[in-house]
């Protein structure tokens, strides 16, 4: 693994993709989505220590300033670098529609 | 302002663009950047309460799951939605070069 992918806090503690099982009720979608009724939501969770999966130069700056001014500048944050599409079958006024959402499931993660 | 831009926590508490004044020493650039010697770093800082500047459906899901499972799923995070370029004059082996960085200064912010 690249240096930027080795977690100094221990396995699984740093920014990475997690899967959270959620019902449509959990998501607040129960009244408009027909299928699936249970979703495997992939999201980015974990700490962003120095040099770990830094997305860009902004993330580097943010980490440097966070170390200097921790009360003012937060550490970089673990967010999706890209997304996987998700297909929902949903209720419409005229029946049932097939809808793809491109920004719903995280595909991989980085620190910004 | 759209509903998603009104901060329920009070003025200036939610995710927005901040300017942090930083020297090259602060940024760890003193040994390779000649100019500017001081940088106005724009970055995204602040809380992401429900429905505030949600970037996409992933952010909506994350907030819903955070409310249900706060110990497992963190709240959405304030990150750059886009960047402003910044020009640095830097030292090279052969002299001095002008380099533009596209991912250095946050231009606007959203919650992901």
């Amino acid at each position: 693994a690249r240096n930027g992918d080795r977690c100094p806090l221990g396995p699984g503690r740093c920014c990475r993709l997690h899967t959270v099982h959620a019902s449509l009720e959990d998501l607040g979608w129960a009244d408009w989505v027909l299928s699936p009724r249970e979703v495997q939501v992939t999201m980015c969770i974990g700490a962003c220590p120095s040099q770990f999966r830094e997305a860009n130069m902004h993330a580097q700056i943010k980490m440097n300033l966070h170390r200097l001014k921790p009360d003012t500048v937060p550490a970089p944050c673990c967010v999706p670098a890209s997304y996987n599409p998700m297909v929902l079958i949903q209720k419409t006024d005229t029946g049932v529609s097939l809808q793809t959402y491109d920004d719903l499931l995280a595909k991989d993660c980085h620190c910004v | 302002a759209r509903n998603g831009d009104r901060c329920p926590l009070g003025p200036g508490r939610c995710c927005r663009l901040h300017t942090v004044h930083a020297s090259l020493e602060d940024l760890g650039w003193a040994d390779w950047v000649l100019s500017p010697r001081e940088v106005q770093v724009t970055m995204c800082i602040g809380a992401c309460p429900s429905q505030f500047r949600e970037a996409n459906m992933h952010a909506q899901i994350k907030m819903n799951l955070h409310r249900l499972k706060p110990d497992t799923v963190p709240a959405p995070c304030c990150v750059p939605a886009s960047y402003n370029p910044m020009v640095l004059i830097q030292k090279t082996d052969t002299g001095v070069s002008l380099q533009t960085y596209d991912d250095l200064l946050a231009k606007d912010c959203h919650c992901v």
């Epitope: 699936p36 009724r37 599409p85 297909v87 079958i89 049932v96 529609s97 097939l98 793809t100 491109d102 | -």
Partner: antibody
């Protein structure tokens, strides 16, 4: 693991009806919908329609509208596809397919051959 | 409805060679495209979804690319078990539609 087990082969006369069953296991039946797909001998795949076990909502291919009915029985985790007024060109292998959140599906039944012949 | 056209209808390839299969949609389907492999007497097997994401357990020699109306399935080095019929499927709109298939046969 997810399994879809379909009923056995059928031979029907033109004008008759056929009802193919698809018993699901390995997941919560009402969490996902079921697609039906058919394949005539030596031909490609044709999508027939979809049903959600959760609410019974359906969406059928236009060319089969009026002849096809998809139903589910949540007590037995079984989906059914009935096709009426059978013609010789309905001779095909009929597959049930569980839907997924990604669009494509790895979960297919083994297929049921329906032969329509006088 | 969206018409999916696959080419060629038959592809003759030697084991170990690369195979490139094409699928064209009559209108944009974004990345809402899947590829299936089918062998005689068997149900189709999902290879790729989202135009380029390999399904669980699918070997790395299978790769998908494209978006909009033009898509490609590439098998980098054909193994004996890869000789089969391949179908593309769009799930961007009802009705879901399949291509006519490409038969990959031994040269």
């Amino acid at each position: 693991q997810v399994q879809l087990v379909q009923s056995g082969a059928e031979v029907k006369k033109p004008g008759a009806s056929v009802k193919v069953s698809c018993k699901a296991s390995g997941y919560t039946f009402t969490d996902y919908g079921i697609f039906w797909v058919r394949q005539a001998p030596g031909q490609g795949l044709e999508w027939m329609g979809w049903i959600t076990a959760y609410s019974g909502d359906t969406h059928y291919a236009q060319k089969l509208q009026g002849r096809v009915t998809m139903t589910t029985d949540t007590s037995t985790s079984t989906a059914y596809m009935e096709l009426r007024s059978l013609r010789s060109d309905d001779t095909a292998v009929y597959y049930c397919v569980r839907d997924t959140q990604y669009g494509g599906s790895p979960y297919w039944g083994q297929g049921t051959l329906v032969t329509v012949s006088s | 409805e969206i018409v999916m056209t696959q080419s060629p209808a038959t592809l003759s390839v030697s084991p170990g060679e690369r195979a490139t299969l094409s699928c064209r949609a009559s209108q944009s389907v974004s990345s809402n495209l899947a590829w299936y492999q089918q062998k005689p007497g068997q149900a189709p097997r999902l290879l790729i979804y989202g135009a380029s994401t390999r399904a669980t357990g699918i070997p790395a020699r299978f790769s998908g690319s494209g978006s909009g109306t033009e898509f490609t399935l590439t098998i980098s080095s054909l193994q004996s078990e890869d000789f089969a019929v391949y179908y593309c499927q769009q799930y961007n709109n009802w009705p879901i539609t399949f291509g006519g298939g490409t038969k990959v046969e031994i040269k």
